[in-house]
Amino acid sequence: SGTTNTVAAYNLTWKSTNFKTILEWEPKPVNQVYTVQISTKSGDWKSKCFYTTDTECDLTDEIVKDVKQTYLARVFSYPAGNVESTGSAGEPLYENSPEFTPYLETNLGQPTIQSFEQVGTKVNVTVEDERTLVRRNNTFLSLRDVFGKDLIYTLYYWKSSSSGKKTAKTNTNEFLIDVDKGENYCFSVQAVIPSRTVNRKSTDSPVECMGQEKGEFREI
């Protein structure tokens, strides 16, 4: 029933957590398909997600090659069916994404408390060092491997019987805190990159409390 025009993509948005990085856009295609291209400022435009009817494209494999580079993507709209291309001289329409620097912008995923161990009035709390999709020498790097000392963790802890929270910070994945003997404590951690201006903090980890399976209690 007549021809329509191809429509340029819009609302191009980077969705990235712990370097898993997906470009999303609108609209849902009608009689058109999309191809995404990604480039660094000095590099070639590499086509990905060829002729897709999806409105997202996983670009993780490209950005993990160098997470400190700044990337730009563009989404091409190609006619597919009863449509006319509105690009000039047969050139397809495309829309550019915002720039994206993974190291500075990827969201920090929700951390997990791996374990806690009490020895007398000290508790050692260990944060799981989450694996990322960044590779070096064919092995996947952890979040700590990638960020080094730029990444800190904040521990929130409180007595199970009260609501007053204390905090501790570490630039490793372990905390050693003082606790009152005979009291049970609850813990939650948050990943933080203090040097960042955006996406500085993760969401808080699930709460873990002493007296539950995750921890170990040793009275000395």
Partner: antibody
Framework: EVQLVQSGAEVKKPGESLKISCKGS????????MNWVKQMPGKGLEWMGM????????RLNQKFKDKATLSVDKSISTAYLQWSSLKASDTAMYYC??????????WGQGTTVTVSS | EIVLTQSPATLSLSPGERATLSCSAS?????MNWYQQKPGQAPRIWIY???NLASGIPARFSGSGSGTDFTLTISSLEPEDFAVYYC?????????FGGGTKVEIK
Amino acid sequence: EVQLVQSGAEVKKPGESLKISCKGSGYSFTSYWMNWVKQMPGKGLEWMGMIYPADSETRLNQKFKDKATLSVDKSISTAYLQWSSLKASDTAMYYCAREDYGSSDYWGQGTTVTVSS
Amino acid sequence: EIVLTQSPATLSLSPGERATLSCSASSSVSYMNWYQQKPGQAPRIWIYGISNLASGIPARFSGSGSGTDFTLTISSLEPEDFAVYYCQQKSSFPWTFGGGTKVEIK
């Protein structure tokens, strides 16, 4: 002017190795995926796979996964298709073709490979 | 993989007649191309994105279809149109071609 020039015809025996080439000119060689297409005598076209010259990422048709290897030499703007051990069923015309959208359509002239004892 | 079945395998027609070539996909396809190939030559893009004529292709050619059924139509055959036509899907990897339809002079 965009051109893809392929290496000449080859006659080989079963079990022998072979590397054929496709040299690109007139465009930024590293910016475009390069396809390889097989056409057996009197038969249709088969997409073998493609390679991105800038970083050598490949997308291979699983049918050819253990049979052929794609590679590039960026310094001389050349893509390669190679076999370590040829079979009679590898007898075919092989085309390289730049991956393009729409009317852009650039193919090599084809390389004939004959495998016979 | 998506299997493309072209029919008929051979179409024997006279110049001036209408030719209808079919391409049926084993699952839904959103991006279909058609190529023309003449003996001793590399294939050449003819129709892209289901219905878009490649540069220099005469208006007597048209492409249509959606989902799993696609058609290339030549409204009035000219002598230079006699060749083999292949459909190709680029919706999912591996990209695949149909077996081809040979349009020959009756």
